[in-house]
Interface confidence: medium
């Protein structure tokens, strides 16, 4: 036997070590009820406590709850370790248009690159499918394998990341190309309304149903708890949070203990009828031509929008703007005020309500 | 020899609050997860919550959570469950019980507190 | 949070005869390769005893007579031939998911 070899059975007599065979060293013996981070421990750092299923040990010592991807829209990026929340993402065919903790609040289909365009990135989980204009010359049917690689889904064109354009541009703006780095600074500038839920949080045992901790009696930090599917309003009262089981609508924030429940029309759907936190009555959205070219827009929302040929070419296409006008909304559901006869005319995410004028223009609906 | 000694019964008037004790012994006190269950007369059992001593770590049973306070002080390896707004529906037996790492089980219980509520 | 249903409510056996109770989860208890099913004996005046754990491991000092089988949702706590002492409730608990849950309880008493 070498020399520097432990005994086996006693690690040299240290009580508080044993000889693992596997890794032929002697391991820390966690103490009773610590578990060991790694097969061979070697000081008491490497042992931990242990948490509840589906909980793991955050930086601060903390059981905290694994996100979960339990929504359709969602898959299983990473499982929950013992140290680290399950991380979830966009199912294949989707992309990420709100982004939350370890997960997406909010997944688009990947847009369909209209005739006239080809696939210049496909969509990942992160990013939407990026189109460009087919080359002069080049066929439609696709120049390369790689600009075919289009969702098979037959979705509505949907987003494009782009720059956000200040409300003080003009509709002769040139359009930015390659943006996207100043759009996604455009888009960490946009403040959200004081009172709107941010779906950027610290994953709880138990959201919306009760308080974050304990509430001894006069605590400032108690609030009255709410039954599930019920938030906790400004006036203080358990008020039901809007259910989003319509066909035509999708959960876009969950209920929350402060806050509602919020619901938008469903993808390739606008809003006709606005109502709180949702949406009386979606209709489908308006399918531009085929001579339309992506356009950059908004980062914000990553909602798709195109260029429209001179205005009045297509009076049944929504156009769509040579800037984003659009301020960060304050309210669930996006709400802007469109001029059906005006020159310019502004973005209409699929979030926004919008209600057919007698024209059988839509005019966006301020709800 | 694991011990989990808690005080004794109680009597307590509606609205008031009760706060049973569970005494550990024989074990790294600070390393296991302490369980509250409760035992309403005849019934059957449920989980409150748990507290980690060794940080003061909690979970909690929604149902019970913002009227349930679980503490633990380490110094005397005693372990602590408060129970605020009491109605007569509290009227039960409470335990304490230490949870196993790796399984999850309970495995050493103390005796029991039975805690009355009556006007 | 996951229901436990425990069926028999009540089981009226012999001394020597074989019982075997059930209790079903309304979801998989599976969680990495085991199922997080437990089960306890309680006396009257006495607290809850570990049986079983991992739906199947017998705790130190139970008799070999307990056996627990069963993954996913469908679990079986079996006393193969039941002692005087055996006669007590039977309770499964879950710890898959916070809040941990226990079945209604299932009483084994003399027929």
């Known amino acids: 036997f070498p020399q520097d070899r432990p005994f086996e059975d006693t690690c040299h007599g240290n009580p508080s070590h044993y000889y693992d065979k596997a890794v032929r060293r002697c391991c820390y013996r966690c103490p009773m009820g610590l578990f060991p981070t790694q097969q061979c421990p070697q000081r008491p750092t490497d042992c931990r406590k242990q948490c509840e299923p589906d909980y793991y040990l955050d930086e601060a010592d903390r059981c905290t709850a694994c996100v979960t991807c339990s929504r359709d829209d969602l898959v299983e990026k990473t499982p929950c370790a013992w140290n680290s929340s399950r991380v979830c993402e966009c199912r294949p065919g989707m992309f990420c248009s709100t982004s939350a903790v370890n997960s997406c609040a909010r997944c688009f289909f990947h847009s369909v690159c209209p005739a006239g365009m080809i696939v210049k990135f496909p969509g990942t989980a992160q990013k939407n499918t990026v189109c460009e204009p087919a080359s002069p010359g080049v066929s439609p049917a696709c120049a390369s394998p790689e600009n075919c690689k289009e969702p098979s889904s037959g979705t509505i064109p949907q987003a494009k990341p782009t720059p956000v354009s200040p409300a003080t541009s003009s509709a002769s703006t040139m359009p930015v190309r390659g943006g996207t780095r100043l759009a996604q600074e455009a888009a960490s500038k946009l403040t959200r309304a004081p009172d709107s839920p941010s779906s950027v949080g610290r994953p709880s045992s138990d959201p919306g149903l009760s308080p974050t901790q304990p509430c001894p009696e006069g605590s400032g930090d108690c609030r009255k708890q709410c039954e599930p599917d019920y938030y906790l309003d400004e006036a203080g009262r358990c008020t039901a949070c809007v259910s989003c089981s319509r066909d035509d609508l999708v959960e876009k924030t969950p209920c929350a203990w402060n806050s509602s429940r919020t619901c938008e029309c469903r993808p390739g759907m606008i809003c006709a009828t606005s109502a709180t936190n949702s949406c009386a009555r979606c209709v489908p959205y308006p399918i531009c031509a085929a001579e339309t070219v992506t356009k950059p827009q908004d980062m914000a929302e990553k909602d798709t929008t195109f260029e429209a040929p001179p205005l009045g070419t297509q009076p049944d296409c929504n156009p769509t703007p040579e800037n984003g006008e659009a301020p960060a909304s304050t309210s669930p559901t996006q709400s802007l005020l469109v001029d059906s006869q005006a020159s310019k005319t502004l973005p209409i995410p699929t979030s926004a309500p919008v209600a057919l004028s007698s024209t059988g223009k839509p005019v966006l609906d301020a709800g | 020899e694991v011990q989990l000694v808690q005080s004794g019964a109680e009597v307590k008037k509606p609205g008031s609050s009760v706060k049973v004790s569970c005494k550990a012994s024989g074990y790294a006190f600070s390393s296991y997860w302490m369980n509250w269950v409760k035992q309403a007369p005849g019934q059957g059992l449920e989980w409150i919550g748990q507290?980690?001593?060794?940080?003061?770590?909690?979970n909690y049973n929604g149902k019970f959570k913002g009227r349930v306070t679980l503490t633990a002080d380490k110094s005397s390896s005693t372990a602590y469950m408060e129970l605020s707004s009491l109605r007569s529906e509290d009227t039960a037996v409470y335990f304490c019980?230490?949870?196993?790492?790796?399984?999850?089980?309970?495995?050493?219980w103390g005796q029991g507190t039975l805690v009355t509520v009556s006007s | 949070e996951i229901v436990l249903t425990q069926s028999p409510a009540t089981l009226s056996l012999s001394p020597g005869e074989r019982a075997t109770l059930s209790c079903r989860a309304s979801?998989?208890?599976?969680?990495?390769?085991?199922?997080?099913m437990l089960w306890y004996q309680q006396k009257p005046g006495q607290p809850p005893k570990l049986l079983i754990y991992s739906a199947s491991n017998v705790e130190t000092g139970i008799p070999a007579r307990f056996s627990g089988s069963g993954s996913g949702t469908d679990f079986t706590l079996t006393i193969s031939s039941l002692e005087p002492e055996d006669f007590a409730v039977y309770f499964c608990?879950?710890?898959?998911?916070?809040?941990?849950?226990f079945g209604g309880g299932t009483k084994v008493e003399i027929k």
């Open positions: 019980a230490r949870r196993i790492n790796g399984n999850f089980a309970m495995d050493y």
């Open positions: 979801e998989s208890l599976e969680y990495y390769g085991t199922s997080l």
């Open positions: 507290i980690y001593p060794g940080d003061g770590d909690t």
């Open positions: 608990q879950q710890r898959r998911k916070v809040p941990s849950t």
